[in-house]
């Protein structure tokens, strides 16, 4: 609601203003009436029976101050010209409102020519004889405005040209947009502008402990001519550690926090935090609990997980399958990952070292989310120790580690991988491979073969190489072939038994 700043109030002045009348005593004059034991003053004129009336009433000089546009509210009565028999020719039912600006008070020096007409003031309702005699006068209210004003002060004047008028109230005021708190911004009392289409842009200031959010617009409002605030732009938000309570920002209570400038209220400190002081932007973690850099302040403090609960290592030739179960204590987090490390030890010397370079994992061994992994390319007759470490988002904040280990001894080489390189009606050319780390342990390879379906006899060939040609074979016959590595410590794991067929005589040309 616009604020009105009153510059002149005749009704409130109790007849003390002493306005100038011209001609003196013959036209407008001050009158007093008593209503409810209170004096009511009015300026009245009623020379309706005489023609050529030109009676002026001029206010005292009114200091303009900061006003740009003034509003003039008049309360008055006008009597019906028909109340005056024979006066209809000269009687009027309107009067004229004028103003004049000046930088000084002219006192009793009244000059009509200095005045500019604002408007002819006509009543909405006239007071007829019967109403007048019954004391039921019809009060009219009219408002006009003038602006922009530029001089130090001004006068208003009322010209009577033969009406029967009583002027009960003259109130002159200007409008201000009142001091305002909106969107946690304070807008100062602002003088309304003088031009109807224009809106004065007013910058607001954030209330104590409020800020313009990053990337947000500075608070602004527009003060309209009628003293109303319009078109709010931007806003302020309570800063970290403060929340909105009505039109102010209040510090978070102890045990509560707010970590950023936002519209949200203060939140209760989460689990595993220490009680916060007043105005906290975060809640510190209890001893042994931590917050990862990316953790929101609203999240409970957490700790590293315990070790994987149960770890098994199952050897399969030169492979080991590691399986484990999640930690019993996740530390309050869901971002658990596992890392697998490998150590190998030579039984003869007891010497140990890392074996990451020589083994192969079924998937990268760091940042594992599954609870199993297969390790292959293990060397025979070697002792392996596998460590599975559980980590979460706060593990990096502590020096201790949460891990479980499992050891396994590899007694055999990995089975060779066998391929048929070529064949004829009487021969089969076979090759094989084993992982390079294991090759140094191999003394010879033993190739066993026999006809399919003949379980009574078999042939053995030994070689140091990685291939052999088996000849003197029967045509168009299926042979079962198996390759096994021989090491100083004994036999390694045999390959799968492969079925290879020699060519038939009629297909030998192929």
């Amino acid at each position: 609601q616009g604020k009105e700043v009153v510059l002149l109030d005749f009704a409130a002045a109790g007849g003390e203003l002493g306005w100038l009348t011209h001609p003196y005593g013959k036209g407008w004059d001050l009158m007093q009436n008593i209503m409810n034991d209170m004096p009511i003053y009015m300026y009245s004129v009623c020379n309706v029976m005489s023609g050529d009336q030109d009676n002026w009433l001029r206010t005292n000089w009114v200091y303009r101050g900061e006003a740009e546009r003034i509003f003039i509210e008049l309360k008055f009565t006008v009597r019906d010209c028909n109340s005056f028999p024979g006066g209809a020719s000269s009687c009027k039912e309107t009067f004229n409102l004028y103003y004049a600006e000046s930088d000084l008070d002219y006192g009793t020096n009244f000059q009509k020519r200095l005045f500019t007409k604002i408007d002819t003031i006509a009543p909405d309702e006239i007071t007829v004889s019967s109403d007048f005699e019954a004391r039921h006068v019809k009060l009219n209210v009219e408002e006009r405005s003038v602006g922009p004003l530029t001089r130090k002060g001004f006068y208003l004047a009322f010209q009577d040209i033969g009406a029967c008028v009583a002027l009960l109230s003259v109130r002159v005021y200007y409008k201000k947009c009142p001091e305002l708190l909106q969107g946690l911004a304070h807008f100062p009392e602002t003088i309304a502008g003088s031009d109807a289409p224009s809106l004065a842009t007013v910058a607001g200031t954030c209330v104590d402990h409020a800020v313009v959010p990053p990337g947000g617009e500075e608070p602004r409002m527009h003060c309209a001519v009628d003293g109303e605030w319009l078109v709010p732009i931007g806003q302020c938000l309570c800063q970290a550690g403060y929340e909105k309570v009505e039109d102010a920002c209040q510090a978070c209570s102890p045990g509560f926090f707010k970590f950023e400038a936002s519209e949200s209220p203060c939140l209760e400190c989460p689990e595993h935090t220490l009680p916060s002081p007043e105005g906290a932007t975060s809640c510190e973690c209890e001893e042994g609990f931590f917050r990862a850099p990316q953790d929101p302040a609203s999240m409970p403090c957490t700790r590293p997980p315990s070790a994987p609960h149960y770890l098994t290592a199952v050897g399969m030739g030169a492979k080991v399958e590691l399986r484990w179960t999640p930690p019993q204590d996740s530390g309050g987090r869901e971002d658990i990952v596992y890392s697998v490390t490998c150590e190998q030890c030579w039984p003869e010397s007891g010497e140990c070292g890392p074996c990451e370079a020589s083994v192969r994992y079924s998937e990268p061994p760091h940042g594992l989310t599954r609870t199993s992994v297969t390790v292959s390319d293990l060397e025979p007759h070697m002792n392996y120790t596998f460590t599975v470490e559980a980590r979460n988002g706060v593990s990096g904040l502590v020096t201790s580690r949460s891990f479980r280990t499992a050891s396994v001894s590899i007694n055999q080489t990995e089975p060779p991988k066998v391929r048929l390189e070529g064949r004829s009606t009487t021969s089969l050319s076979v090759s094989w491979s084993i992982p390079p780390p294991q090759q140094s342990r191999v003394w010879k390879y033993e190739v066993t073969y026999r006809k399919k379906g003949d379980s009574n006899s078999y042939n053995v060939r030994r070689t140091e190489g990685f291939s052999v040609t088996l000849d003197d074979l029967a045509p168009d016959t299926t042979y079962l072939v198996q390759v096994q590595a021989l090491t100083q410590e004994g036999q390694g794991a045999g390959s799968k038994v492969h079925e290879f067929q020699t060519l038939s005589p009629e297909g030998s040309g192929n």
Partner: antibody, heavy 120, light 110 residues
């Protein structure tokens, strides 16, 4: 106590002059319009003249216009009526009176009256 | 015209009600004021405006107006009310500033 005390009346020959005074007390004299009203022996009250609170404006009844002059000295709280070219028909008791509001009254405070007799 | 006309005299028995009238064109435009004058003294304001009494004036005195007529009514007249009564009004004709009636002599019988 609000009062108006008059002085200066008496017997004067036709064509002569006389000055009446009216001393005010008990109120802010400079805030009120002041009037002179007369009453011929056994006759009606007759309004004579008015002066505005600041003394800048005066108005006279046609019967005395050009012969009588109303004035005031607000510093002395005193109202005056200078009567020149007096006539027999000016014989009357002269009252000063205060207009309670505005220029035309009503007249709420009256002086005690002073008799002016114009006779040869 | 700018004249106010009053009856020269009226009489009333003590305790009775009496009305003094005042006629004039100005009374259409302006309210009358009423004054009481006792012999050898200055007039005293009784009624002004619609029907306003200055402090100290008994409430048995009242005023009213209608058209070109104004009235002063004394309800329950008393012996001390015997006096001359004058009506007065602003002049709407522009001839005079203010006009008085010629007064009404009130006699309280008994």
């Amino acid at each position: 106590q609000v009062q108006l005390v008059q002085s200066g009346g008496g017997l004067v020959q036709p064509g002569g002059s006389l000055r009446l005074s009216c001393a005010a007390s008990g109120f802010t004299f400079s805030s009120y319009a002041m009037h002179w009203v007369r009453q011929a022996p056994g006759k009606c009250l007759e309004w004579v003249t008015v002066i505005s609170p600041d003394g800048h404006n005066t108005y006279y009844a046609d019967s005395v216009k050009g012969r009588f002059t109303i004035s005031r000295d607000n510093s002395k709280n005193t109202l005056y009526l200078q009567m020149n070219s007096l006539r027999a028909e000016d014989t009357a008791v002269y009252y000063c009176a205060r207009a309670s509001v505005g220029a035309t009254g009503p007249f709420d405070i009256w002086g005690q009256g002073t008799l002016v007799t114009v006779s040869s | 015209s700018s004249e106010l006309t009053q009856p020269p005299s009226v009489s009333v028995a003590p305790g009775q009600t009496v009305t003094i009238t005042c006629q004039g064109d100005s009374l259409r435009s302006y309210y009358a004021s009423w004054y009481q004058q006792k012999p050898g003294t200055a007039p005293k304001l009784l009624i002004y405006g619609e029907n306003n009494r200055p402090s100290g004036v008994p409430d048995r005195f009242s005023g009213s107006s209608s058209g070109t007529s104004a009235s002063l009514t004394i309800t329950g007249a008393q012996a001390e009310d015997e006096a001359d009564y004058y009506c007065n009004s602003r002049d709407s004709s522009g001839t005079h500033l203010t006009v008085f009636g010629c007064g009404t002599k009130l006699t309280v019988l008994g």
